[in-house]
């Protein structure tokens, strides 16, 4: 048989007497129907005039129109009303009435749960007519069901706008258990209790649970759904699966691995993206974080410099993106870097070393005893400084850069002159007359121009005046001399 | 509160059968499995199988298979432990253990001492 | 089967010393339980998956280890821990218990 029909069941034909037609009574398309007692409410109304209806699925025709003949009520005959079949098994259930003759257009609609059935259902309605009456049979079959298919399934039936339904057979699709919610993957503390949790479904009810760790059952009894298992901590990975029996059998979870939080492995390929006189720009591809998202990192910079007092300096940093500016260097200075990152339980060792350089830097000291006086026969000025004493970690000297601004009468006008390193003199042609010159002179390297010295001042008078006394800037100091010829 | 109560000492003929008995109080008697223990005179404790108590299928460790048996009286939540044609080497006290996750046993009966002597 | 070797048989110590026992396994296990044993009574339950102390025991005592070699320390001894230790594996069966570790109070 397609279904399995748990029904203490007297089988009894559809009809009373055999049909016309070629109407097949294998035991696939007719089931063994349950004899059940007791009457329905009936439906009255006319064949050609509806009275108010009662509730119920019978209707009882009133007297004929030839006005002599009672007609027999109007209703479903009953039929199984409890189908428990596997998942994946055919069934076929039906509804038959008989309807007299007097009546046209009938229609029977199955419905499901309330919901009418349309579309793509397999229903069949058969047509067995007699003298009297034509017996109908209403059909539905599903192949190879599915838990979607569990519920409550009725006939109705339309006639002279009066519907007529049938007693309900429901339909319950049984299979191995259905998870509704299965364990989940988790990162956990070392040697901290956390809960899993793994629900299923039947039917068949009810639906049992044992918990599996690393293959080994953790209960050796089931528990009912859902169930809830407190790990009371692991030092090592493990993996949980849980296992649901039901009457039709077991279904396994699918195996979740619950790992343990560790401190993150260290950064790796740290790498120099740019360097300048007093920064470097440093990348990193961060290590394994552990199982936990990584909180911050911190770079390490130590000088490679016998002399350095070998102190460390850490700038901290967030962890993404893995790139940091470090800054506040020297110039011209070697550098070895690492980087270390950590999460919540902890930092990483810290990365393989990298060497680094800062470039040469811009010179700190501007030229000393910047001396500057008049050349009137040649009509320029003559300026004479000192080298300044630059550090080494300005670099090498390429030469100086010689700002003079003449100012008369409200206009004002900068030149700039570049000189070589070898140089501590300059002459510059006269611009303006009747004007004052200011010279400021800066040291040049490789890493920029350095500060510009205290601005020296000559007043330039009209032809005529001569005069050589210079004006200069003493070495040390910072005054703002001014020498007026 | 939870308990196991076991039956009184027993003194028995080689050859005789005993039968011990475990009652439980203060939880569901078939939710949980009852492992059943040995410790001989001065010895350490050595884990007999048990029973569960849902099904009533005993699981037996290796060396405690033939003439030992499992077995419960679900309506009286009480397990019991008998042992057919018994032997000097039998001598011991039996315990009774309540199963738990990761076959934890967090509570015991008192012990039921059985001595077997001619 | 899994086999437990408890080591040492008998541990003698004075009260207020640190001491440990261990618990090792012929292969790798997921939990081990320990339970204390005074004579003429049953085991009581002690210490449960390697580190949860069970109720009423003194926070004195700590458990410990992974894989093959697992631990009880007591911290400070006190008279009334002179007991048998019994450890028991969990992540094979049959369930197995070592052969105990007497602790003897000096």
């Known amino acids: 048989a397609i279904t399995e029909a748990r029904e203490e069941a007297k089988p009894y034909p559809l009809f009373p007497g055999p049909l016309p037609g070629s109407l097949q009574t294998d035991h696939t398309s007719l089931l063994s129907l349950p004899h059940t007692s007791g009457y329905q409410p009936a439906l009255m109304f006319s064949p050609t005039q509806p009275g108010r209806p009662y509730t119920g699925n019978v209707a009882i025709p009133r007297v004929t129109s030839a006005g002599s003949k009672l007609l027999p009520p109007l209703a479903f005959k009953h039929t199984v009303g409890h189908i428990i079949l596997s998942e994946h098994k055919d069934v076929k259930f039906n509804c038959s009435i008989s309807v007299p003759n007097i009546y046209q257009d009938t229609t029977i609609s199955w419905w499901k749960d309330g919901k009418e059935l349309l579309g793509a259902h397999h229903a069949i309605t058969q047509f067995y007519p007699d003298d009297e009456v034509t017996a109908i049979i209403a059909s539905f079959s599903i192949t190879s069901v599915q838990r979607s298919d569990n519920g409550s399934y009725i006939c109705k039936m339309k006639i002279n706008n009066e519907e007529i339904v049938s007693d309900p057979i429901y339909i319950e699709v049984q299979g191995l258990p259905h998870f509704t919610k299965q364990p989940e993957s988790m990162n956990v503390t070392r040697n901290t209790a956390f809960n899993l949790t793994c629900q299923a479904v039947g039917p068949p009810e009810p639906v049992n649970i044992f918990w599996v760790q690393n293959s080994s059952r953790v209960n050796e009894q089931p528990e009912k759904s859902p169930s809830v298992l407190t790990v009371p901590g692991l030092t090592e990975m493990a993996v949980f699966s849980c296992e649901a029996h039901n009457d039709k059998g077991l279904t396994v979870s699918k195996g979740v691995q619950i790992n343990i939080k560790a401190i993150p492995s260290p950064p790796t390929e740290v790498s120099i993206h740019n360097s300048t006189a007093h920064s470097i720009l440093i990348s990193w591809v961060p290590g394994f974080d552990g199982y936990s998202p990584f909180r911050n990192c911190s770079v390490q910079v130590k000088e490679v410099d016998p002399l350095s007092n070998g102190s460390v300096m850490i700038f901290n940093t967030s962890a993404s993106p893995h790139m940091y500016q470090i800054k506040q260097l020297q110039a011209l200075a070697n550098y070895s870097i690492g980087v270390s990152c950590m999460n919540e339980i902890g930092w990483s060792a810290v990365s393989p070393w990298i060497l680094a350089s800062t470039t040469e830097g811009a010179p700190s000291v501007a030229p000393l005893n910047v001396t500057v006086f008049l050349n009137e026969s040649r009509d320029n000025v003559d300026i004479r400084w000192m080298k300044p004493l630059t550090k080494r970690q300005a670099g090498e000297l390429v030469g100086y850069r010689i700002s003079h601004v003449w100012q008369s009468a409200g206009i004002s006008k900068e030149l700039l002159e570049e000189v070589g390193q070898n140089n501590s003199r300059a002459q510059i042609s006269v611009q303006v007359h009747n004007a004052t010159c200011t010279v400021r002179i800066a040291a040049v390297t490789k890493g920029g121009v350095g500060p510009f010295s205290d601005p020296v001042k000559i007043f330039i008078p009209a032809h005529g005046w001569v005069d050589h006394a210079p004006s200069s800037t003493p070495a040390p100091g910072n005054a703002d001399p001014v020498l007026i010829i | 509160q939870i308990q196991l109560v076991q039956s009184g000492p027993e003194l028995k003929k080689p050859g005789e059968t005993v039968k011990i008995s475990c009652k439980a109080s203060?939880?569901?008697?078939?939710?949980?499995?009852m492992n059943w223990v040995k410790q001989a005179p001065g010895k350490d404790l050595q884990w007999m199988g048990w029973i569960n108590t849902y099904t009533g299928e005993p699981t037996y460790a290796d060396d405690f298979t033939g003439r030992f048996a499992f077995s419960l009286e679900t309506s009286a939540s009480t397990a019991y432990l008998q042992i057919n044609n018994l032997k000097n080497e039998d001598t011991a006290t039996y315990f009774c253990?309540?199963?738990?996750?990761?076959?934890?046993?967090?509570?015991w009966g008192q012990g039921t001492l059985v001595t077997v002597s001619a | 089967q899994i086999v437990l070797s408890q080591s040492p048989a008998i541990l003698s110590a004075s009260p207020g010393e640190k001491v440990t026992m261990t618990c090792r396994s012929s292969s790798s296990v997921s939990y081990m339980h320990w339970y204390q044993q005074k004579p003429g009574s049953s085991p009581k339950p002690w210490i449960y998956?390697?580190?949860n102390l069970a109720s009423g025991v003194p926070g004195r005592f700590s458990g410990s280890g992974s894989g093959t070699s697992y631990s009880l320390t007591i911290s400070r001894v006190e008279a009334e821990d002179a007991a048998t230790y019994y450890c028991?594996?969990?992540?094979?069966?049959?369930?197995?218990f070592g052969g105990g570790t007497k602790l003897e109070i000096k």
């Open positions: 203060g939880y569901t008697f078939t939710n949980y499995g």
């Open positions: 998956a390697t580190s």
């Open positions: 253990a309540k199963g738990g996750h990761y076959a934890w046993f967090a509570y």
């Open positions: 028991q594996q969990w992540g094979s069966n049959p369930r197995t």
